[in-house]
């Protein structure tokens, strides 16, 4: 069964940027992948990021720079200041859409006792919706 | 499919200046990188300079100090500013984009060609 994982770090320099890596674990080939925070995408969530192998990238304030790392993992930073700014039990939420597997998808946020510059480690989130 | 077009070639002399220009197809979504390629008579393409959506520039040494590679206002638009043009630099330009920046898709454009001499 495909897994999605998601790591939340608190960078230790700046403490309103923050880093969210997210990955599949499966054998197909990832066609999208949608980055949001405050909850999943299209449910009261806000899409920060969309990654396209084929066609690019898509980001919104407060994301500064979303990559793909490999081609099936993905990384985001976010920087924001005042309303824009993420804070420490923001949740972030990442949804792989896959061929064959669907669309999968997990969240993840920091730790309530996470220090800046710590991260929880990037084990396979609960996987919230499989479309 | 990202389509890429090409403008600004030509003749010049050496010691001149050209300013490539590259359109891109793709407007939604950004191209994470973008860059230029050439490929002279015989020899085969190379790097010339590349450019990612955030900013970060490489150079292949022989065009350092001479070309700058930069992306426009308008989205996915990849300019080539070169100066201090030697007859070396005569080839067919291309603009090229990785939208993954894994090589998973890489697209090209058809070329513009840069003759220096005098």
């Known amino acids: 069964t495909p897994e999605v994982w998601v790591q939340v770090r608190m960078e230790a320099t700046e403490l309103s940027s923050f880093t969210i890596r997210c990955g599949f674990l499966g054998s197909g080939s990832i066609s999208l992948v949608t980055v949001s925070w405050g909850g999943p995408n299209g449910a009261g969530g806000t899409t920060l990021a969309v990654l396209h192998p084929e066609r690019g990238i898509r980001q919104w304030a407060p994301a500064r720079q979303a990559r793909w790392e490999t081609q099936s993992s993905i990384s985001l930073i976010l920087e924001g200041s005042g309303a824009s700014s993420p804070c420490a039990n923001t949740t972030f939420c990442c949804k792989f859409a896959s061929f064959p597997e669907g669309s999968w998808e997990a969240c993840g946020s920091l730790p309530p006792s996470s220090d800046p510059g710590l991260s929880a480690p990037p084990t396979p989130a609960p996987i919230l919706r499989a479309d | 499919e990202v389509q890429l077009v090409e403008s600004g070639g030509g003749l010049v002399q050496p010691g001149g200046s050209l300013r490539l220009s590259c359109a891109a197809s793709?407007?939604?979504?950004?191209?994470?990188?973008m860059g230029w390629y050439r490929q002279a008579p015989g020899k085969d393409r190379e790097l010339v300079a590349t450019?990612?959506?955030?900013?970060?520039?490489k150079y292949v040494d022989s065009v350092k100090g001479r070309f700058t590679i930069s992306r426009g206002d308008a989205k996915n638009s990849l300019y080539l500013q070169m100066n201090s043009l030697r007859a070396e630099d005569t080839a067919v330009y291309f603009c090229?984009?990785?939208?993954?920046?894994?090589?998973?898709?890489?697209?090209w454009g058809q070329g513009t060609m840069v003759t220096v001499s005098s």
């Open positions: 450019i990612t959506y955030t900013g970060s520039i």
């Open positions: 090229n984009a990785d939208p993954s920046g894994l090589g998973r898709k890489v697209y």
């Open positions: 793709e407007t939604y979504f950004d191209l994470y990188v």
